[in-house]
Amino acid sequence: EVEKTACPSGKKAREIDESLIFYKKWELEACVDAALLATQMDRVNAIPFTYEQLDVLKHKLDELYPQGYPESVIQHLGYLFLKMSPEDIRKWNVTSLETLKALLEVNKGHEMSPQVATLIDRFVKGRGQLDKDTLDTLTAFYPGYLCSLSPEELSSVPPSSIWAVRPQDLDTCDPRQLDVLYPKARLAFQNMNGSEYFVKIQSFLGGAPTEDLKALSQQNVSMDLATFMKLRTDAVLPLTVAEVQKLLGPHVEGLKAEERHRPVRDWILRQRQDDLDTLGLGLQGGIPNGYLVLDLSMQEALS
């Protein structure tokens, strides 16, 4: 069909409404004014346009805003956001959290798309850091968001933002990420009392050093085995049997089921067998009684 540029008589759009769904693609192109579309973007989402028709509407906005859409338009893109490419989004300057929320809502329930990743990246870079409200919003839509960031990116998270993090947000974080997040969490929760502090810090303990685990063992915290198994092996190894017993409290019984897995396995190898026997759990593999234990860590570092 030959492209027609003139709008047929009587078809010029006075407003964005449902009558437009009956327009052919060329009629939308010819009869919808881009400036009208921009001012009435909030209506587009309520109208069941086809994907082809949405392509036309996007094209009209692209012509009107070649340097990137203004935030007043972006906030009301709705399903038209799904038509945007990462290249389109890189031209935007999104500063409002409400705009971010509106666009994330469109993609809700789906994996993080390249478009969403680009949008978030633009938004966070624009703000200069991952503040609490932003983190709260992002982890609500994408629980794994925090763990998708590099340790370098995580270093820009201020301690105050840690309050927005839920345990499930850290499920896929690796030790390097927790190494960055743990000190921030420790700082964020430092004024809480013992039991409340442990509840909050628990999810971050995969980044905790030995000294902090020793301190926790004196606070009657009853760490569960799932948390213990996520601790850094190098942080667990120096703990004594008595310290692990105090750290785990009633959960110490669970060590038996995990004795072949790290870090329990490696910890057992570092303990005297007679100390392990005091637990009455049948843990085997400790240093036999009567053997001399040498600290070779310095020698290993020098060799």
Partner: antibody, heavy 116, light 107 residues
């Protein structure tokens, strides 16, 4: 496979004595704390005594303190309960159990009846 | 001594039902609580330790919750093999003490 087999139960007169034994197989006996637990007819479970892995620490329920003695022979993988001055209320099935505060494995029990 | 009180002492339910048994300690025992399943002529079997941790090999339909003085054992969907007597036990301090048991019967 962990197995605990109790023996030594039977009928005894009030004031009499009995020695229960528990033979342990399928695990390193010398590493585990052991317990005796009993259950009287139509009653619930009652903890009796505990011994640590090397036999240096024992604890008893008040109701048997001074009358019962728990001991172990790690060389023979055997747990014992020496019961003296038996009373009618000591009538029960006696179980040995492995574990710390939690009894992870139990024997099938041996019946002790105290009656004149 | 720490007293442990279970309720109900007996209950009847059908296969597929969700069942809850409670246990109350006479003083704070933290999470130092374990649950056992006992079938006639069989040795007790440990199901849950530390109030909510599942012993290895125990089906996930069993779960425990609570801390301090009030605890719950829940069976999310009863199976024929679950009909038994259930005991709670504290191991916070000696003497170790058990609840009086809760007998779960087929309706």
């Amino acid at each position: 496979e962990v197995q605990l087999v109790e023996s030594g139960g039977g009928l005894v007169q009030p004031g009499g004595s009995l020695r229960l034994s528990c033979a342990a197989t399928g695990f390193t006996f010398s590493s585990y704390w052991m317990h005796w637990v009993r259950q009287g007819p139509g009653k619930g479970l009652v903890w009796v005594s505990r011994i640590n892995s090397d036999g240096t620490s024992t604890v008893y329920a008040d109701s048997v303190k001074g009358r019962f003695t728990i001991s172990r022979d790690n060389a023979k993988n055997t747990l014992h309960l020496q019961m003296n001055s038996l009373r009618a209320e000591d009538t029960a099935v006696y179980y040995c159990a492995r574990g710390r505060g939690i009894m992870t494995y139990w024997g099938q029990g041996t019946l002790v009846t105290v009656s004149s | 001594d720490i007293q442990m009180t279970q309720s109900p002492s007996s209950l009847s339910a059908s296969v597929g039902d969700r069942v809850t048994i409670t246990c109350r300690a006479s003083q704070d025992i933290g999470s130092w609580l374990t649950w056992y399943q006992r079938k006639p002529e069989k040795a007790p079997k440990s199901l849950i330790y530390a109030a909510s941790s599942l012993q290895s090999g125990v089906p996930s339909r069993f779960s425990g919750s609570g801390s301090g003085t009030d605890f719950t054992l829940t069976i999310s969907s009863l199976q024929p093999e679950d009909f038994a007597t259930y005991y709670c036990q504290q191991y916070k301090s000696y003497p170790l003490t058990f609840g009086q048991g809760a007998k779960l019967e087929i309706k």
